[in-house]
């Protein structure tokens, strides 16, 4: 009679975490008499997974009825698989012995790999805002996946980025893995509405990658441009000077008017106008009573944007070009329309 063979038909199987794994094993003969045991691993350190004769194995069930006299199917099902269950499983036939059963023949083994989905990628940007033309770093992290093979891509507004570095940890064997990637992005003035996307593709995701996003609005600071202009005269002795604060982001902005270096008024930006690119404009005006000034007036619009050092723009009002008539009760002449002298030798 042909000697008993232990047949494990599956060289390897892959199971999703949380599912059940079926490990197939059949024998070709009922002789010799003796139990079947399942082990994970080989040699003296192997781990007993199931013993036909004794022990308590709550996660293991047999596929067929082992009490039947002619049963030759010793397949088992392991429930609620976790990444820690990965390994090589052996179906081993023992023959009756005294006092102990003697290992008789082993199957070739079935390698169980466990598929676990990566967590949703989390994208984080720099702690401090940066201005256009600067390069900033974004990180993307995803955890808990198995097997180790994974693909990560970066996009900015749908355009794939190439300047990034990715690591999968640990370098050695593990029940599950993590990925960490750092991408470098050059900011432009138009990036307030831009998004950076980290995309992770893994065998467990069936071609539907996971994405994590970061809005560049959280990262960018677009400094304002200032323009100070003199408006037409509102009254005979008043000049309206406006400070146009354009194309800034974020909204946080404080403006101070200085007359000859002395603070005239401070205000916080409100009722802003939003541009298509997400930046803001704001305008502040100052009424200057020319008759109150004997000398030229230097008007400065000073803007502190988002906690940064103040930027300023100045405008000169030349009062001396229009000397007032002493003792006259008549209203003074028209206010200066510009900083340049109005004809004459000045």
């Amino acid at each position: 009679e042909e000697e008993l063979q232990v047949i494990q038909p599956d060289k390897s199987i892959s199971v999703a975490a949380g599912e059940s794994a079926t490990l197939h094993c059949t024998v070709t003969s009922l002789i010799p008499v003796g139990p079947i045991q399942w082990f994970r691993g080989a040699g003296p350190g192997r781990e007993l997974i199931y013993n036909q004769k004794e022990g308590h194995f709550p996660r293991v069930t047999t596929v067929s009825d082992l009490t039947k006299r002619n049963n030759m199917d010793f397949s088992i099902r392991i429930s609620n698989i976790t990444p820690a269950d990965a390994g090589t499983y052996y179906c081993v036939k023992f023959r009756k012995g005294s006092p102990d059963h003697v290992e008789f023949k082993s199957g070739a083994g079935t390698e169980l790999s466990v598929r676990a989905k990566p967590s949703a990628p989390v994208v984080s940007g720099p702690a401090a805002r940066a201005t256009p033309q600067h390069t900033v770093s974004f990180t993307c992290e995803s955890h808990g996946f198995s097997p180790r093979d994974i693909t990560l891509k970066w996009f900015k507004n749908g355009n794939e980025l190439s300047d990034f570095q990715t690591n999968v940890d640990p370098a050695g064997d593990s029940v599950s893995y993590s990925i960490h990637s750092t991408a470098k992005v050059v900011l432009t003035r138009e990036d307030v509405h831009s998004q950076v996307i980290c995309e992770v593709a893994h065998v467990t995701l069936q071609g539907d990658p996971l994405r994590g996003t970061a809005n560049l609005s959280e990262t960018i600071r677009v400094p304002p441009t200032l323009e100070v202009t003199q408006q037409p005269v509102r009254a005979e002795n008043q000049v309206n000077v406006t400070c146009q604060v354009r194309k800034f982001y974020p909204q946080r902005l404080q403006l101070t008017w200085l007359e000859n270096g002395n603070v005239s008024r401070t205000e916080t930006a409100s009722t802003l106008t939003e541009n298509k690119d997400g930046t803001y404009n704001w305008m502040s005006w100052l009424l200057v009573n020319v008759s109150a000034h004997r000398d030229d007036v230097k008007l400065t619009c000073q803007v502190e944007h988002d906690g940064q050092p103040a930027v300023s723009k100045s405008h000169d009002l030349k009062v001396s070009a229009h000397p007032k008539e002493q003792g006259s009760n008549t209203a003074p002449g028209p206010a200066l329309a510009s900083a340049a002298p109005l004809g004459g030798s000045g």
């Epitope: 040699g43 350190g45 090589t88 081993v92 008789f104 082993s106 050695g172 064997d173």
Partner: antibody, heavy 122, light 112 residues
Framework: QVQLQESGPGLVRPSETLSLTCTVS????????WSWIRQPPGKGLEWMGF???????FYNPSLKSRVTISLDMSMNQFSLKMTSVTAADTAVYYC????????????????WGQGTTVTVSS | DIVMTQSPLSLPVTPGEPASISCKSS???????????LDWYLQRPGQSPQLLIY???NRASGVPDRFSGSGSGTDFTLKISRVEAEDVGVYYC?????????FGGGTKVEIK
């Protein structure tokens, strides 16, 4: 191709603890036993113990009370710690890989590190 | 523990000639599965040991076929059919039937 590299101090004071690490490169820790074997100057080989991929350890009874072998699969490393060393522990220490197959058991220590010399002296 | 005894202690050889090393164990290394749990290793001068023969008679990968292992139970032999200069070094037998794994004392092979 799998390679093993031992690392650790070359000099240990008597009564102190010897600590060595073996880094496995070019292969997996899974499905193998990982041994420490030593060779005193001019003498033969002595098996100290090994650890399986599941963390189960086996030690030489002559050293058991002093030796601990541990495994860090995530770093592809395994380590040896031996307490209360004396001059008799001066040796070249080798880390090695032991193959194992179900139905057979252990079948050959097929990969060895180049060895690291440890001197116990004050 | 299983005690392994090797002989001779030293073996002067002539290149091109055969050589034989004996290894005896204090108990049988033949298990009920039919395998003999004995390995042979060569340690060349200044190098780490390398596996030559495993499970009594199986040549390891890359080992020249001039090396052969035989024996069962307690008596084992390593044969080199035609010694070459690169074969010098210390040969060790090791039992892998049970822990602790134990080595023979070694046989030093040198060119005459």
């Amino acid at each position: 191709q799998v390679q093993l590299q031992e690392s650790g101090p070359g000099l240990v004071r008597p009564s102190e603890t010897l600590s060595l690490t073996c880094t496995v490169s070019g292969g997996s820790i899974r499905n193998y036993y990982w041994s420490w074997i030593r060779q005193p100057p001019g003498k033969g080989l002595e098996w100290m113990g090994f650890i399986y991929d599941n963390g189960r350890t086996f030690y030489n009874p002559s050293l058991k009370s002093r030796v601990t072998i541990s495994l860090d699969m995530s770093m592809n490393q395994f380590s040896l710690k031996m307490t209360s060393v004396t001059a008799a522990d001066t040796a070249v220490y080798y880390c090695a890989r032991v193959r194992a197959y179900s139905g057979i058991g252990l079948d050959g220590t097929d990969v060895w590190g180049q060895g690291t010399t440890v001197t116990v002296s004050s | 523990d299983i005690v392994m005894t090797q002989s001779p202690l030293s073996l002067p050889v002539t290149p091109g000639e055969p050589a034989s090393i004996s290894c005896k164990s204090s108990q049988s290394l033949l298990y009920s599965n039919g395998y003999a749990y004995l390995d042979w290793y060569l340690q060349r001068p200044g190098q780490s040991p390398q596996l030559l023969i495993y499970l009594g008679s199986n040549r390891a990968s890359g080992v020249p076929d001039r090396f052969s292992g035989s024996g069962s139970g307690t008596d084992f032999t390593l044969k080199i059919s035609r010694v070459e200069a690169e074969d010098v070094g210390v040969y060790y037998c090791m039992q892998a039937l049970q822990t602790p794994l134990t080595f023979g004392g070694g046989t030093k092979v040198e060119i005459k």
